[in-house]
């Protein structure tokens, strides 16, 4: 006999990165017929919703009208059908941004490179932080962590056209409190038709440094060849 129901999906709208004092909605999608949803924050019960009528609703929303550092952290949700509870959802990392200062993002050798060239981003912030985050904007957001006293290096290695995109960086005061974003830097990679062998086969980023793709709304639209989990999961652990 089944002891638990399948885990629900959890995500944040419009985004998991929320500027301070702005609003955000945490969505939890379970099953039709669920009579109760619970939202947990940092392991403790945070909010409860009982949808009516349960047989016509499979998603609930928890509204946060005014984001601040106390609301930033890890959320998960569960739901109940009758007496049977679901497995907990994956963890959603909700981040507050626009805290304190604005870093500077630069790219070496420059914003226009040839496929196969090694590219490094530099994120600099002169105030007290030692963790930096590089974010490639998109339907989902790649997040890469770097460390340094006032500056962090983000080596992308030999790039391909899959690395084209808009990048920003943040200083991080803790895992869930980030600075204002840097000005965006666009990276344009064009193929080197003399040396196509320079381009690596897999244009994704180093697996040990990239966080999970979050908030993808459509499958297969990223240029990157790897497929990513679309649910909000363990971004920064």
């Amino acid at each position: 006999q089944q002891q638990t129901l399948p885990k629900p999906f959890i995500w944040a709208e419009p985004h998991f990165m929320v500027p301070k004092e702005k609003q955000v909605t945490i969505c939890c999608q379970g099953n039709y017929g669920a009579v109760e949803y619970q939202l947990h924050f940092e392991g403790s019960l945070f909010a409860v919703d009982r949808p009516k009528p349960p047989e016509r609703i499979n998603k609930v929303q928890f509204y946060i009208p005014d984001m601040n550092s106390r609301m930033a952290g890890q959320y998960s949700c569960i739901y109940r059908v009758g007496e049977l509870w679901s497995e907990p959802s994956n963890l959603l990392d909700l981040v507050v941004t626009e805290m304190y200062d604005t870093p500077t993002l630069s790219v070496h050798p420059g914003p226009e490179v040839i496929s196969g060239e090694k590219v490094t981003f530099y994120c600099r912030l002169d105030t007290a932080t030692s963790m930096f985050l590089l974010l490639k904007e998109g339907r989902s957001s790649h997040v890469q962590r770097g460390y340094g006293k006032v500056q962090a290096e983000f080596p992308l290695g030999p790039v391909t056209t899959a690395h084209r995109g808009t990048y920003r960086c943040f200083g991080s005061y803790n895992n869930h409190a980030w600075s204002f974003p840097s000005e965006p830097v666009k990276l344009l990679v064009t193929g080197d038709i003399e040396n196509t062998s320079l381009a690596p086969e897999d244009p994704t980023f180093p697996a040990d440094t990239w966080g999970t793709y979050l908030l993808t709304t459509e499958t297969g639209l990223q240029k990157d060849h790897a497929l990513w989990d679309h649910t909000a999961q363990n971004l920064l652990r």
Epitope: E112, K136, G138, R164, K186, T190, D192, I193, T196
Partner: antibody, heavy 122, light 107 residues
Framework: DVQLQQSVAELVRPGASVNLSCTAS????????MHWVKQRPEQGLEWIGM????????KYAPKFQGKATITADTSSNTAYLHLSSLTSEDTAIYYC???????????????WGQGTTLTVSS | SIVMTQSPKFLLVSAGDRVTITCKAS??????VAWYQQKPGQSPKLLIY???NRYTGVPDRFTGSGYGTDFTFTISTVQAEDLAVYFC?????????FGSGTKLEIK
């Protein structure tokens, strides 16, 4: 609503120059790349070049080097194509197009202007 | 420059037919290929990007495939409103280049 607005037509004399404009609305051109494409009557599409309006960096097809100059004015959200020493070979429709931008850019043309018909004739 | 060799130049088909257009790049262009439709008197419109992704709002009768040098564009069931010229385009390497176009005419 994203739009790229171009003037409908230009008539110029051989040997003269012309400046074609492409005014964007619904997005900031600084956040993407703007391209120009030529189409001669009953012929295919030819990529002229592109600009990164954020820094003014340009790329051109070798064929249009010296013939075309692409600029952008971010304050008016407008990209320009300047064509010099015009001949009948330059008679064509000129389109501006943007590389897709929806909070970030992707490299395909999702929006095109309606095209400016340039006629070079004495 | 990378040359995109597109074939055929013309297609005369009946409504309901299946149509395939090919584009061959002179060198590998990864999957940086898009397909555009240009109806008479109009600007080109994006149909397919990154070789196989259908753009928002494009009917699912339009599909694309390929990687490297060989690319295919298919209309599974041609309709009267598909009368147009179809172009492939690579933006892997500058100068970016287009195929010469395929004119689709309906009987």
């Amino acid at each position: 609503d994203v739009q790229l607005q171009q003037s409908v037509a230009e008539l110029v004399r051989p040997g003269a120059s012309v400046n074609l404009s492409c005014t964007a609305s619904g997005f900031n051109i600084k956040n993407t790349y703007m391209h120009w494409v030529k189409q001669r009557p009953e012929q295919g599409l030819e990529w002229i070049g592109m600009i990164d309006p954020a820094n003014g960096n340009t790329k051109y097809a070798p064929k249009f080097q010296g013939k075309a100059t692409i600029t952008a004015d971010t304050s008016s959200n407008t990209a320009y194509l300047h064509l010099s020493s015009l001949t009948s070979e330059d008679t064509a429709i000129y389109y501006c197009a943007r590389w897709a931008y929806d909070g970030y850019y992707e490299s395909y043309f999702d929006y095109w202007g309606q095209g400016t018909t340039l006629t070079v004739s004495s | 420059s990378i040359v995109m060799t597109q074939s055929p130049k013309f297609l005369l088909v009946s409504a309901g037919d299946r149509v395939t257009i090919t584009c061959k790049a002179s060198q590998s262009v990864s999957n940086d290929v898009a397909w555009y439709q240009q109806k008479p008197g109009q600007s080109p419109k994006l149909l397919i990007y990154y070789a196989s992704n259908r753009y928002t709002g494009v009917p699912d009768r339009f599909t694309g495939s390929g990687y490297g040098t060989d690319f295919t564009f298919t209309i599974s069931t041609v309709q009267a409103e598909d009368l147009a010229v179809y172009f492939c385009h690579q933006d892997y390497s500058s100068p970016f280049t287009f195929g010469s176009g395929t004119k689709l005419e309906i009987k």
